[in-house]
Amino acid sequence: IFPLAFFIYVPMNEQIVIGRLDEDIILPSSFERGSEVVIHWKYQDSYKVHSYYKGSDHLESQDPRYANRTSLFYNEIQNGNASLFFRRVSLLDEGIYTCYVGTAIQVITNKVVLKVGVFLTPVMKYEKRNTNSFLICSVLSVYPRPIITWKMDNTPISENNMEETGSLDSFSINSPLNITGSNSSYECTIENSLLKQTWTGRWTMKDGLHKMQSEHVSLSCQPVNDYFSPNQDFKVTWSRMKSGTFSVLAYYLSSSQNTIINESRFSWNKELINQSDFSMNLMDLNLSDSGEYLCNISSDEYTLLTIHTVHVEPSQETASHN
């Protein structure tokens, strides 16, 4: 009945509603139907959120923070529905709401506890800083404070640096991990316990490939089944690192099934893509193609990074000419 938020029943006429920042929610309240309905929603027993009586809204003394953000289900009041539709919730809206309903038969009071969560999609980045390599798991806006865990080759790592910036609304969090010289696979999990939402970033380093000039190279990129759900929208990006920064070679959007290729020697196999295999070919290699190639498969729930190191060596012909 109430699709915009989920709520948990707890004792004493009190329910917990969990909403997401900037989304609409419903604070539920029901009563035994009767005539002469009076409905008063209040926040923290002090601030007037919404009043309805004598068949219409009375918002003259509504607290300004709720202006144009609240409404009732007017066609359902006579059926005992006093629920409040609440637009664009913010973290400042968290707290206890009391719904007073009076009718010709009875008066009831319901309490609803509103909790608001934020979870902007995190990202996993691979960065080179001088001679060091770092994996960084970051989330731009999250509330409450998330749980971040790292694993190396599926074994939890205790070392977990967290750089946190708090704003009025939420936290911004970076968790960097130094992976210099490592060939292990790494996994970072960020969990928002309130919203029951988990995001996972996984990084895998493939064996280095040695190729001759003018040859072509095939670089594999297949999602791990544990994370990958083909029904979910995702994006695949292939990029190459040159002098510390990545330049995008190509990307694919699952929603539109669009492929954009920025490098003419790059090719993707359409049939393989349909089988969720995003391996790529790079033709006619030259010496400047040496470097790190990164495949990034990302959705709202995961980021899968696969890194290949390619060494392009001069062909025999080129060497003998020199």
Epitope: V38, G102, V107
Partner: antibody
């Protein structure tokens, strides 16, 4: 059963003050708005003031605004009407009456028996 | 303020009669009207709310009708116990106002 009992009436000189009380029982006091309604001897009924269930909203008739103050103590189930600068025309039986619900409806389901206030020099 | 005018001021009727009291508002009050009965020396008693809804415990010989500015209270068969003064009251808006009352006498 619902009971409202007024007290505090008496004879007072013009310009003086008086405080009326109303003791409520038989219902959850903090759920209901309570009104004061008065009736001058041999005359009709006149609404005086209302205080809503939680005490934050108070409304007054023009004839008493600025002179009378309505208040309540939900922990003691009592209602008060502080009457200042009394005038001869304030002479009446004062009734406390319970609203249908919060105080927002504005009609009177249960009444006390009233207390007489006489303003006379 | 909204003015409420009742008619007649006094009404004399016999037991068993059908009695009608009228109340007129100076402006539309939708159906936000109540009727009270006050017996001599007693507090008023709610009979009708929302123009036509009978309060719990009130005998069914009492009924109310009307909306906007014209309202009536009807006693279908007058009983000796109905000797009282009857008041209408608007609760559309503050200040709530009463009619001046209709005194009902039994012949």
């Amino acid at each position: 059963q619902v009971q409202l009992v007024e007290s505090g009436g008496g004879v007072v000189q013009p310009g003086r003050s008086l405080r009326l009380s109303c003791a409520a029982s038989g219902f959850t006091f903090s759920d209901y708005g309570i009104h004061w309604v008065r009736q001058a001897p041999g005359k009709g009924l006149e609404w005086v003031a209302v205080i809503w269930y939680e005490g934050s909203d108070k409304y007054y008739a023009d004839s008493v605004r600025g002179r009378f103050t309505i208040s309540r103590d939900n922990s003691k189930n009592t209602l008060s009407l502080q009457m200042n600068s009394l005038r001869v025309e304030d002479t009446a039986v004062y009734y406390c009456a319970r609203d249908r619900s919060s105080g927002a409806m504005g009609y009177f389901v249960y009444w006390g028996q009233g207390t007489l206030v006489t303003v006379s020099s | 303020d909204i003015q409420m005018t009742q008619s007649p001021s006094t009404l004399s009727a016999s037991v068993g009669d059908r009695v009608t009291i009228t109340c007129r508002a100076s402006q539309s009050i939708s159906s936000w009207l109540a009727w009270y009965q006050q017996k001599p020396g007693k507090a008023p008693k709610l009979l009708i709310y929302k123009a036509s809804s009978l309060e719990s415990g009130v005998p069914s010989r009492f009924s109310g009708s009307g909306s906007g500015t014209e309202f009536t209270l009807t006693i279908s068969s007058l009983q000796p116990d109905d000797l009282a003064t009857y008041y209408c009251q608007q609760y559309q808006s503050y200040s709530y106002t009463f009619g001046q009352g209709t005194k009902l006498e039994i012949k």
